[in-house]
């Protein structure tokens, strides 16, 4: 079941849905570019991707601080109950923009831009990233991540923008967490009902990659729930 | 019209502080990365600090770095820079702008900023 507003945007946003997106980026004064296609179900809340480093590979930081910039951020592919207005959905034709903070543990941060249009029925994302600070013996720099647990963002509406809060953690090869505390406003491109506080509920998993992590597949399931919901639909 | 309105300025010892702030109007303000430029009799007007659209992004001159803090109230359509640790170098007229288009990242030219304000004049003395 969708809502009204969702129910006018479904010729817009269709039951399946391509992007494309190519991010620039630095990290640590590494410049990179990646480029990458992916597809889902926006009203299903599950979308894949491929990812390819085009300029700048085998990058020198673990690609887990750049996987949630494609698909954290490709948020049309939430799946959303008909009593939350699903705000970056009905942004569309139009579309959205983005931008994030990523405070790292250890010092090291990640600011993040981007914008999503639609184009010939596709969605396109245009990304770029910063990182700087990241300690050359950190779990980054050594490469040393294994992946990010799932995760709750907690969206509220705030100064004609959507804003989201996660406390993620990703995994550590010696089984430890490596935390981030992470910062997102979402802002439509056109005037757009708010929707009140809720959660989404996040998982991304890599499932494919390389050996340098030059080509790297990712999947995504993300579920937004009023704020009492739990996280084990994500597991199933 | 767009309209940028700074104020904040003064006279102020070496080690003191001041917060300037920059009123607009005439545009979406949330919509656009704002910039604080500087000039000192003789010199040319250089960069101080930026914030992006949802003050997420922050940029510093190296100068300034540790001492300024650039912030931005949506609501008011205000942007600030809390200066700190003042030196005599930084004695100028400090202007904001607001960046031409709402992708700014990290750009600090003036060439990336459309629209300016008048300026406030900031002494420091010794």
């Known amino acids: 079941m969708v809502s009204k507003g969702e129910e006018d945007n479904m010729a817009i946003i269709k039951e399946f849905m391509r992007f494309k997106v190519h991010m620039e980026g630095s990290v640590n004064g590494h410049e990179f570019e990646i480029e990458g296609e992916g597809e889902g179900r926006p009203y299903e809340g599950t979308q894949t991707a491929k990812l390819k480093v085009t300029k700048g590979g085998p990058l020198p930081f673990a690609w887990d601080i750049l996987s949630p910039q494609f698909m954290y951020g490709s948020k049309a592919y939430v799946k959303h109950p008909a009593d939350i207005p699903d705000y970056l959905k009905l942004s569309f034709p139009e579309g959205f923009k983005w931008e994030r903070v990523m405070n790292f543990e250890d010092g090291g941060v990640v600011t993040v831009t981007q914008d999503s249009s639609l184009q010939d029925g596709e969605f396109i994302y245009k990304v770029k990233l910063r990182g700087t600070n990241f300690p050359s013996d950190g779990p980054v720099m050594q490469k040393k991540t294994m992946g990010w647990e799932a995760s709750s963002e907690r969206m509220y509406p705030e100064d004609g923008a959507l804003k989201g809060e996660i406390k993620q953690r990703l995994k550590l090869k010696d089984g430890g967490h490596y935390d981030a505390e992470v910062k997102t406003t979402y802002k439509a491109k056109k005037p757009v009902q708010l929707p009140g506080a809720y959660n989404v509920n996040i998982k991304l998993d890599i499932t494919s990659h390389n050996e340098d992590y030059t080509i790297v597949e990712q999947y995504e399931r993300a579920e937004g729930r009023h704020s009492t919901g739990g996280m084990d639909e994500l597991y199933k | 019209q767009v309209q940028l309105v700074e104020s904040g300025g003064g006279l102020v010892q070496a080690g003191g502080s001041l917060r300037l702030s920059c009123a607009t109007s005439?545009?979406?303000?949330?919509?656009?990365?704002m910039g604080w430029f500087r000039q000192a009799p003789g010199k040319e007007r250089e960069f101080v600090a930026a914030?992006?659209?949802?003050?997420?992004?922050?940029d510093y001159a190296d100068s300034v770095k540790g001492r300024f803090t650039i912030s931005r109230d949506n609501v008011k359509n205000t942007v600030y820079l809390q200066m700190n640790s003042l030196k005599p170098e930084d004695t100028a007229v400090y202007s904001c702008?607001?960046?031409?288009?709402?992708?700014?990242?990290?750009?600090?030219?003036?060439?990336?900023?459309?629209?300016w304000g008048q300026g406030t004049q900031v002494t420091v003395s010794k």
């Open positions: 005439g545009f979406t303000f949330s919509d656009y990365a």
């Open positions: 702008a607001a960046a031409k288009s709402g992708t700014w990242w990290y750009q600090r030219s003036e060439n990336d900023f459309g629209s």
């Open positions: 914030i992006s659209w949802s003050g997420h992004v922050t």
